[in-house]
């Protein structure tokens, strides 16, 4: 954690392991008002490394639904719609934070958890050409 | 939130707005032990839609450092290394959860926030608008 001077207006923490356990307000503030995330929603179909989105649901996790990308092909798609064997479709992965109910089924107690999700796919050259 | 029967072993919540504010254990559990996220770290350079990673730092946020992808080209890179302007490099975006210190500078009080981040880039066929 980052050492930040305590503000006198901060809520009190009675947790002896402070700041291991913190209070989190679940009223989500969405900073994406100026951006429309749906604008990228058709990329999965138009990409040269297209992907399908699979729903991953877990009621013990917040958010309970996460969408996982799975590349449709091992190779990339050429302009004519056929596979290019010389290029590979690969998933772009990102570590994200989720909240895991702990103890299980508790509505007001969570643990922070890092999970790796595939967000989409990109087309890469399989061989790195090393210059002598 | 999801209505889940309260488990008798759950921590008590004295917050009158329960379950708007919850307790979160910041000892992160990492579920990615079987996967090595670094293995995809060179895709940004080998992709036909390569990207650069920019560091976005905010001490009032957890995690404080987030890496943002910016596509290097408007078009996609061909096998010969030249840019194909008939195709478009576009960012793959994902909404992620972060914790925002609230009130500001408080070490143990946060609000959940959704932000949109660009994770990498993919090469897509442009939408051609046909004039009637």
């Amino acid at each position: 954690g980052i050492a930040i001077p305590r503000n006198s207006g901060c809520p009190n923490s009675e947790d002896k392991n402070f700041p291991r356990t913190v209070m989190v307000n679940l009223n989500i503030h969405n900073r994406n008002t100026s951006t429309n995330p749906k604008r990228s929603s058709d990329y999965y179909n138009r990409s040269t490394s297209p992907w399908n989105l699979h729903r991953n649901e877990d009621p013990e996790r917040y958010p309970s639904v996460i969408w996982e990308a799975k590349c449709r092909h091992l190779g990339c798609v050429k302009a004519d719609g056929n596979v290019d064997y010389h290029m590979n479709s690969v998933p772009i992965q990102q570590e994200i934070l989720v909240l895991r109910r702990e103890p299980r089924h508790c509505p007001n107690s969570f643990r922070l958890e890092k999970i790796l999700v595939s967000v989409g796919c990109t087309c890469v050259t399989p061989i790195v050409h090393h210059v002598a | 939130g999801i209505a889940i029967p309260r488990n008798s072993g759950c921590p008590n919540s004295e917050d009158k707005n329960f379950p708007r504010t919850v307790m979160v254990n910041l000892n992160i559990h990492n579920r990615n032990t079987s996967t090595n996220p670094k293995r995809s770290s060179d895709y940004y350079n080998r992709s036909t839609s390569p990207w650069n990673l920019h560091r976005n730092e905010d001490p009032e946020r957890y995690p404080s450092v987030i890496w943002e992808a910016k596509c290097r080209h408007l078009g996609c890179v061909k096998a010969d290394g030249n840019v194909d302007y008939h195709m478009n490099s576009v960012p793959i975006q994902q909404e992620i959860l972060v914790l925002r210190r609230e009130p500001r500078h408080c070490p143990n009080s946060f609000r959940l926030e959704k932000i949109l981040v660009s994770v990498g880039c993919t090469c897509v066929t442009p939408i051609v608008h046909h004039v009637a």
């Epitope: 091992l74 050429k78 590979n88 690969v90 | -």
Partner: antibody, heavy 120, light 107 residues
């Protein structure tokens, strides 16, 4: 039941030609990638050709490029390998193999193989 | 081309033994690895794809592991029908290439 049956192998002189066929049954042939893989006597496996589900993409390793041609007739559920300018080192059992996907990357079903012998 | 080096080239083992076969690629193949079993006079039979995914119908005593350049096929308890030659194959970079094979013989 998935079945792949190769035919067309035999003895041919160096410089000669041969056309192998692979008759497929028990699955929707037109939706699967197919390949030819060969195995020289007492040796390991070597990729010879790949073709995707509709014949729009093919690949050949340098060892056969310009001499061999893979094709398919989805209406006849048949895969072909046209082999020209045959050399002694092309002597092998030739297998046709199916990819569980559209394209031809790895192989979940194989034929019994047909022996091609190139010798004078 | 990516070179696939299998080891050992042959091994002798008894029924019930745990057997491990390794395959090393000349560069990272990003888990795009298949394992096959071949018996004399027969075509190869797919056991594993994607380095770890067991094909349907393949006994659970077979398992694949590894990442990057190094991969392993393990037979947890060797059965009489497992005496055969095993091949790995990479499908990351064309041309797809196979290892030289590992012959598993009865001790």
């Amino acid at each position: 039941e998935v079945q792949l049956v190769e035919s067309g192998g035999g003895l041919v002189q160096p410089g000669g030609s041969l056309r192998l066929s692979c008759a497929a049954s028990g699955f929707t042939f037109s939706t699967y990638g197919m390949s030819w893989v060969r195995q020289a006597p007492g040796k390991g496996l070597e990729l010879v050709a790949i073709i995707n589900h509709n014949g729009g993409s093919t690949f050949y390793p340098d060892s056969v490029k310009g001499r061999f041609t893979v094709s398919r007739d989805n209406s006849k559920n048949t895969l072909y390998l046209q082999m020209n300018s045959l050399r002694a080192e092309d002597t092998a059992v030739y297998y046709c193999a199916r990819d569980p996907r559209h394209d031809g990357y790895f192989f979940d079903y194989w034929g019994q193989g047909t022996l091609v012998t190139v010798s004078s | 081309d990516i070179q696939m080096t299998q080891s050992p080239s042959s091994l002798s083992a008894s029924v019930g033994d745990r057997v491990t076969i390794t395959c090393r690629a000349s560069e990272d193949i990003y888990d795009r690895l298949a394992w096959y079993q071949q018996k004399p006079g027969k075509a190869p039979n797919l056991l594993v794809s994607g380095a770890t995914s067991l094909e349907s119908g393949v006994p659970s005593r077979f398992s694949g592991s590894g990442s990057g350049k190094d991969y392993t096929l393990t037979i947890s308890s060797l059965q009489p029908e497992d005496f055969a030659t095993y091949y790995c194959q990479q499908y990351w970079s064309v041309p797809w290439t196979f290892g030289g094979g590992t012959k598993v013989e009865i001790k």
